[in-house]
């Protein structure tokens, strides 16, 4: 039985001014990306809204987001997809410098929803600004989680060539099977289109010289990928600050050695 009263969920409510934020982000995105100059952001918002408004927020399906996903079709050139897990900020800093590589949040739909929370209420046209379902405490089929699962699946499915993934070497599980990368993206890379997955393991400590590519969880990732007939490579990024600096200035003498 679906409740008729306003549900009190365990998670924080919809981000303040959510419709205005999505619309403004969409307009900004189309202004910065000339290839998207034709996009009617009102239509994008209508499709976004249609995915969760008036629906019970613990019963959202990937199907609900299909109209939006259909509208937001974008392709990334082969060899230019960057996935990430538990290290979003560095991944985004990297694509801001290396402008020809793209994370999901560099694409229209990911850009629209990044860091936002939203949910509606069953049988009303209202957005719930008080509370939204928490993935652990309430339900996993909530509007935000299902959105990211849907767009992450699509992003992985369309990747081709050599796909890169940035992983956080400071975590106890460098590769986590329960992360979006581990549970969705890894399993939706298409072996007929993806030749290889290259993992970049980002080290946290300055003096950390271990080969984290030998970590048991990385070996687990290698096993999963190899079984899917995709080659696997792994690189240690010992100094993320230096790494970014060298992406910015590849001619710097300290960047030229191996």
């Amino acid at each position: 039985v679906l409740p008729r009263w306003r549900q009190q969920w365990s998670g924080s409510g919809t981000t303040s001014r959510f419709p205005e934020t999505v619309l403004a982000r969409c307009v900004k995105y189309t202004e910065v990306h000339p290839e998207m100059r034709h996009v009617d952001c009102q239509s994008v918002w209508d499709a976004f809204k249609g995915a969760f408004i008036s629906k019970y927020p613990c019963n959202i399906t990937e199907e609900d987001y299909q109209p939006l996903v259909k509208l937001g079709t974008q392709t990334v050139p082969c060899n230019k997809t960057l996935l990430w897990s538990r290290i979003k900020d560095l991944a985004h800093q990297f694509t801001q410098v290396q402008r020809d590589m793209f994370t999901l949040e560099d694409m229209l739909l990911g850009y629209l929803a990044d860091d936002l929370t939203w949910c509606g209420e069953f049988n009303t046209f209202e957005i719930n600004y008080q509370s939204c379902p928490d993935w652990r405490k309430d339900c996993s089929n909530n509007p935000v989680s299902v959105f990211w699962k849907t767009v992450s699946r699509r992003f992985a499915e369309t990747a081709c060539g050599v796909v890169h993934v940035m992983l956080n070497g400071s975590r106890s599980k460098i590769f986590d099977k329960n992360s979006t990368f581990g549970s969705v993206e890894v399993h939706n890379l298409q072996p007929e289109k993806v030749q290889a997955l290259e993992a970049w393991v980002i080290h946290g400590g300055r003096e950390d010289s271990r080969d984290l590519c030998q970590d048991p969880t990385i070996k687990e990732l290698e096993s999963i990928i190899s079984k899917r007939n995709i080659r696997f490579f792994c690189k240690n990024i010992y100094r993320p600050d230096k790494f970014l600096q060298c992406v910015k200035n590849p001619e710097d003498s300290s960047c030229l050695s191996g």
Partner: antibody, heavy 118, light 110 residues
């Protein structure tokens, strides 16, 4: 004011080639996307090709892809359409058009007639 | 290349209101802006409406555009003899990576 003047049209045999030019003035040519649109006799408008500003990206209608090449020379304020392997169905008035930021064709030339016939 | 669907003709007496429909799909009108052009024989086409419902300066407010879902329409109110022309809708199509035009609607003032 904005002016777009097409030239290079004429009569050509099937399988032949032709190069259309469009001379642009009255705006910063290098800033804008440019397109070719055609109208066959008694038919409607049909988009043919577009070229972006900056490092040019090109887009083509399925009906001309592989046969036509759109290009631009920003130094000369000129847009071109190289048409190879011409067919009778390519007979049309070809218009050069300037694209505004949100995709609309704000300015059009008067058109140049291309006739493909043996 | 599948275009947008328009009625071949529309007519009305002077002063009347005429509406032209334009139907497409989720990959063109559904996601992207709709544009309307007026074309008089022997002249260059003229932009009437951009971004679904915006009029360029110089276009009379008798012309108005709207969009809903995968369809759009152009309304001409207070029809005048100089409005006799062919009218085309257009939109970018994401699946084709190109523009699609409607087949055109000939407007006649009776």
């Amino acid at each position: 004011q904005v002016q777009l003047v097409e030239s290079g049209g004429g009569l050509v045999k099937p399988g032949g080639s032709l190069r259309l030019s469009c001379a642009a003035s009255g705006f910063t040519f290098s800033d804008d996307y440019m397109s070719w649109i055609r109208q066959a006799p008694g038919k409607g408008l049909e988009w043919v090709a577009s070229v972006s500003n900056g490092r040019p990206t090109t887009y083509y209608a399925d009906s001309v892809r592989g046969r036509f090449t759109i290009s631009r020379d920003n130094a000369k304020n000129s847009l071109y359409l190289q048409m190879n392997s011409l067919r009778a169905e390519d007979t049309a008035v070809y218009y050069c058009a300037r694209e505004a930021w949100s995709g609309e064709f704000t300015d059009w030339g008067q058109g140049t007639l291309v006739t493909v016939s043996s | 290349q599948a275009g947008l669907t328009q009625p071949p003709s529309a007519s009305g007496t002077s002063g009347q209101r005429v509406t032209i429909s334009c139907s497409g799909s989720s990959s063109n009108i559904g996601i992207n802006f709709v544009y309307w052009y007026q074309h008089l024989p022997g002249t260059a086409p003229k932009l009437l409406i951009y971004k679904n419902n915006q009029r360029p300066s110089g276009v009379p407010d008798r012309f108005s555009g709207s969009k809903s879902g995968n369809s759009a329409s152009l309304a001409i109110s207070g029809l005048r003899s100089e409005d006799e022309a062919d009218y085309y809708c257009a939109a970018w199509d994401d699946s084709l990576s190109g523009y699609v035009f409607g087949s055109g609607t000939k407007v006649t003032v009776l």
